[in-house]
Interface confidence: low
């Protein structure tokens, strides 16, 4: 039975040209995390595999940095980065847990900085 829950940064915003940390946290389960996938809509951004470590998609290697932890740092943000991001936790023996984050990249300096986990 899948008892775990995923806590995410939820809906966050950041300024164009800045950076943001996308973070998910799996709790309430003793399942072993074997892999975490980070995706933007239908594109794979990065994989963190328990045995093989991080793999950043070549399409994003200049703007995506692994961590902190199982999170993902997006750099040099553009307005086109606005959209849904998914953290997909592959666990054993529970199965798959998915979290959703919505990122809005703003042109001006009106980005909100109150979201949990968000870096200034």
């Amino acid at each position: 039975m899948m008892t775990g829950t995923i806590e995410t940064t939820g809906n966050i915003s950041a300024e164009k040209g800045g950076s943001i940390i996308l973070q998910c946290h799996l709790s309430s389960t003793t399942a072993q995390v074997t892999q975490v996938n980070w995706e933007q809509q239908d594109q794979l951004l990065a994989i963190c595999n328990a045995d093989l470590g991080w793999h950043i998609s070549p399409s994003f290697k200049d703007r995506v940095a692994p961590g902190p932890g199982l999170g993902l740092t997006l750099q040099s943000l553009t307005v086109n980065d606005t959209g849904e991001y998914f953290c997909i936790y592959h666990t054993y023996p529970d199965g798959t847990y998915t979290g959703r984050i919505f990122l809005e990249v703003l042109e001006s300096s009106v980005a909100e900085h109150g979201a949990r986990f968000q870096i200034p």
Epitope: N37, E39, Q43, L44, H55, S57, I88
Partner: nanobody, 120 residues
Framework: QVQLQESGGGLVQAGGSLRLSCVAS????????MGWYRQAPGKQRDLVAL???????NYPDSVKGRFTISRDNVKNTVDLQMNSLEPEDTAVYYC??????????????WGQGTQVTVSS
């Protein structure tokens, strides 16, 4: 409904080769990471090979140089070419795919497994 169907398993002598194939079918929006895992009797399911959406591959040391994973994004297939097989490779091999059936619906699907037996 999404299904993964493996084929290609069987009995082979040590030093021989096998090619496993897996096809994903059903209401598929997009497929992210695809992979192969294996499970020997009494042991946990272990990673064998991964291929990401951009074609990058990852292998654990135990199969590196002997196994090759490949995918066809048009046919929704993932293959595993296994060479220089050893008795320790005996296991049930499972196909795995991170499949999106809609913009917000992502989960990992597993095949039913195909038995590979390597005799000495």
């Amino acid at each position: 409904q999404v299904q993964l169907q493996e084929s290609g398993g069987g009995l082979v002598q040590a030093g021989g080769s096998l090619r496993l194939s897996c096809v994903a079918s059903g209401s598929i929006f997009s497929i992210g990471t695809m992979g192969w895992y294996r499970q020997a009797p009494g042991k946990q399911r272990d990673l064998v090979a991964l291929v990401t959406i951009d074609g990058s591959t990852n292998y654990p040391d135990s199969v590196k140089g002997r196994f090759t994973i490949s995918r066809d994004n048009v046919k929704n297939t993932v293959d595993l070419q296994m060479n220089s097989l050893e008795p320790e490779d005996t296991a049930v091999y499972y196909c795995n795919a991170n499949i999106r059936t809609g913009w917000s619906s992502v989960r990992t699907y597993w095949g039913q497994g195909t038995q590979v037996t390597v005799s000495s």
